[in-house]
Amino acid sequence: SQPQAVPPYASENQTCRDQEKEYYEPQHRICCSRCPPGTYVSAKCSRIRDTVCATCAENSYNEHWNYLTICQLCRPCDPVMGLEEIAPCTSKRKTQCRCQPGMFCAAWALECTHCELLSDCPPGTEAELKDEVGKGNNHCVPCKAGHFQNTSSPSARCQPHTRCENQGLVEAAPGTAQSDTTCKNPLEPLPPEMSGTMLM
């Protein structure tokens, strides 16, 4: 019959059959079970007994199959660093944080540790849309044709120029990247400086 694959078992080549859920214990030269997420090693394995696991206490966690003798302490999202919570800490997962609105991640070490204010985009531009909010600082791009943006803002979007005719008005001044179209009532006279350009 085939040798059993249930830990603890001898391993002369120092490798275990299930790398995710087992580990090689060098003192005893055996493969032992790791503890599942949400637990830790309360008693280490030996040749007679497999690893004994216990549930992480409140406000602590272990995310992966492990052979840690402690659970990691849950840490709150630090508002001083510009972070806010999106999901609470559980025994199997650390607190999930993200940058507060209007901020981007300025320091990354496996996870975001420090957020900073997004740069303003000047009039005539808008922040390029990113796949993930808060991942990087703003990259300002010009408003596309027929659109404008008239503030210095980290989040303002370019808006389409007003179409005067849709409102029963006529265009008094064309829109630019930084300003909207100016409309007027069709019965209103042209301003004096424009009278020379009227067709008779």
Epitope: Q2, Q4, V6, A10, R29, A43, S46, R47
Partner: antibody, heavy 122, light 111 residues
Framework: QVQLVESGGAVVQPGRSLRLSCAAS????????MHWVRQAPGKGLEWVAI????????YYADSVKGRFTISRDNSKNTLYLQMNSVRDEDTALYYC???????????????WGQGTTVTVSS | QSVLTQPPSVSAAPGQKVTISCSGS????????VSWYQHLPGTAPKLLIY???KRPSGIPDRFSGSKSGTSATLGITGLQTGDEADYYC????????????FGTGTKVTVL
């Protein structure tokens, strides 16, 4: 030198109790698991029980489970075997044996005492 | 009754070689390391081989061990009269409840 000396062996009536002791010297007793192993007259070796280096866990052979209790006093460097409800088949030479170390490369059953004789007879 | 089976006896002339087999199952030899012990009359048993094939310091290289599947073997070469003793294999067993098991024992006689 490393030494294990058993004592407490005696003639005891079936159903009665007896306590064996094992005095350890020459090594850090509190760092080692310890075993009791026995050999009945004309028979082979039989493992009886193990206790962890810190006394946190114990295991027993099915033949003695519920009747025998292994214990230790690390302050006295002494291992014990409390034998209750003894039977005729418990008649044997009882050896105290050094087990696995808490913090060294695994090396089990490497030091044996000379044994103490238990005779169960009415 | 032991779950590790050994031949009751083996014999050979001085200088010859003997081998002792130890047969178990997947719950003991199949998944654990095997040790071998020498028990000379009137003395305490002595550890000869551990982890299938390793010798403690002081044990001559005339003694060797091996394991394959659910069986283990002890070899003694250059047999000497002082080798006349009972030999036991041993390993941890994880069938129902964990325990250490010894083999039935083999008497080695030097002719």
């Amino acid at each position: 030198q490393v030494q294990l000396v058993e004592s407490g062996g005696a003639v005891v009536q079936p159903g009665r109790s007896l306590r064996l002791s094992c005095a350890a010297s020459g090594f850090t007793f509190s760092s080692y698991g310890m075993h009791w192993v026995r050999q009945a007259p004309g028979k082979g070796l039989e493992w009886v029980a193990i206790i962890w280096y810190d006394g946190s866990d114990e295991y027993y052979a099915d033949s003695v489970k519920g009747r025998f209790t292994i214990s230790r006093d690390n302050s006295k460097n002494t291992l014990y075997l409390q034998m209750n409800s003894v039977r005729d088949e418990d008649t044997a030479l009882y050896y105290c044996v050094r087990g696995d170390s808490e913090d060294f490369y695994y090396y089990d059953f490497d030091v044996w005492g000379q044994g103490t004789t238990v005779t169960v007879s009415s | 009754q032991s779950v590790l089976t050994q031949p009751p006896s083996v014999s050979a002339a001085p200088g010859q070689k003997v081998t002792i087999s130890c047969s178990g199952s997947s719950s003991n030899i199949g998944k654990n390391y095997v040790s071998w012990y020498q028990h000379l009359p009137g003395t305490a048993p002595k550890l000869l081989i551990y982890d299938n094939n390793k010798r403690p310091s002081g044990i001559p290289d005339r003694f060797s061990g091996s394991k394959s599947g659910t069986s283990a073997t002890l070899g003694i070469t250059g047999l000497q009269t002082g080798d006349e003793a009972d030999y036991y294999c041993g390993t941890w067993d994880h069938s129902l409840s964990a325990s250490y098991v010894f083999g039935t024992g083999t008497k080695v006689t030097v002719l």
